[in-house]
């Protein structure tokens, strides 16, 4: 088999063998090496010499195999846009951001650019759990049987109704989706409106 061409090598059809790590240089009609993440082109390739790469300066990065002659400026996560930092910028990776707690991504352009406050879920509901935090606004779902949630909140979870017997008490009023069971001491009289149901 023929030996694999090593950059720089001639290319008649303007395409290179390894699209990720090589690029077509039209002036010389050759394929040259791209620079790896964390580096940039310090000297362009020629017919007899491949691309020379150098490490990105402090406060800058290049994320991909590239033929940039400069690196990108590290930028912070913008708190006014509701973003917070989860990992600082390195020479190979831009600052990693996510939505602040209680927020979701409202604008996406390759990455999240703007977060907004999650909507409240009303009493009797809770936010459906998502695979990824901050990915979308709340979708409120009713509490399942035997559970309640009594606030308007973006994050409150439905809780199981109190079982009065577990506490040595008896049920005075049943729980609903919006309120917990009301318990009372078994020796206490029932409220007047319920006394007619008792055997004398």
């Amino acid at each position: 088999s023929q030996p694999q061409a090593v950059p720089p090598y001639a290319s008649e059809n303007q395409t290179c063998r390894d699209q990720e790590k090589e690029y077509y240089e039209p002036q010389h009609r050759i394929c040259c090496s791209r620079c790896p993440p964390g580096t940039y082109v310090s000297a362009k390739c020629s017919r007899i010499r491949d691309t020379v790469c150098a490490t990105c300066a402090e406060n800058s990065y290049n994320e991909h195999w590239n033929y940039l002659t400069i690196c990108q400026l590290c930028r912070p996560c913008d708190p006014v846009m509701g973003l917070e930092e989860i990992a600082p910028c390195t020479s190979k990776r831009k600052t990693q951001c996510r939505c602040q707690p209680g927020m979701f991504c409202a604008a996406w352009a390759l990455e999240c650019t703007h977060c907004e406050l999650l909507s409240d879920c009303p009493p009797g509901t809770e936010a459906e759990l998502k695979d990824e935090v901050g990915k979308g606004n709340n979708h409120c779902v009713p509490c399942k049987a035997g559970h309640f949630q009594n606030t308007s909140s973006p994050s409150a979870r439905c809780q199981p109704h109190t079982r009065c017997e577990n506490q040595g008490l008896v049920e005075a009023a049943p729980g609903t989706a919006q309120s917990d069971t009301t318990c009372k001491n078994p020796l206490e009289p029932l409220p007047p409106e319920m006394s007619g149901t008792m055997l004398m």
Partner: antibody
Amino acid sequence: QVQLVQSGAEVKKPGSSVKVSCKASGGTFSSYAISWVRQAPGQGLEWMGGIIPIFGTANYAQKFQGRVTITADKSTSTAYMELSSLRSEDTAVYYCARPSYYLDGWLDYWGQGTTVTVSS
Amino acid sequence: DIVMTQSPDSLAVSLGERATINCKSSQSVLYSSNNKNYLAWYQQKPGQPPKLLIYWASTRESGVPDRFSGSGSGTDFTLTISSLQAEDVAVYYCSQYYTTHYTFGQGTKVEIK
């Protein structure tokens, strides 16, 4: 030495469009973000948007979104700014500018400016 | 967008005297991970494009006379001309590059008293 040379002055009617060019020389055009900044008579500087030619991605100030289009032609090392639905308030000097230390850092190099007059 | 506010709007200073221009940003432009302030100062003379004077809030661009200095951090910044010269008559602008949506102050006009 990096130079940004802009197209000549334009006089336009309200409601029409203008396209201003910015030709770069003396540096690697495609690796630097080109910004467009305008200055109305007697007013301050206002960033309109920018483009990174090698990525082909443009980003615009909210104020101009939908009315401005920024493009770049890597083969001629030229960036373009087109502003549509012109009104008298768009009368200004339009500058292109680019960084030198970083792909998208502070603006070191500026074009000479293009005067656009919008008048009926 | 980050709003930049300069004070005063104009300033008249005698030759050889100190001129001080203030700039306030609506949010911090300090990036805690690298402890750098993403703020630049520009000088613009009539009929000319702006000229970069200072970046990273306090680093002078090469060729800029050392009478120009920048200071401040977070949201409050100052440009100082220690001894005003006739050629310093111009409008001065602060600008943030903390976000890729650059914004400028409204400008401060410096004149000779």
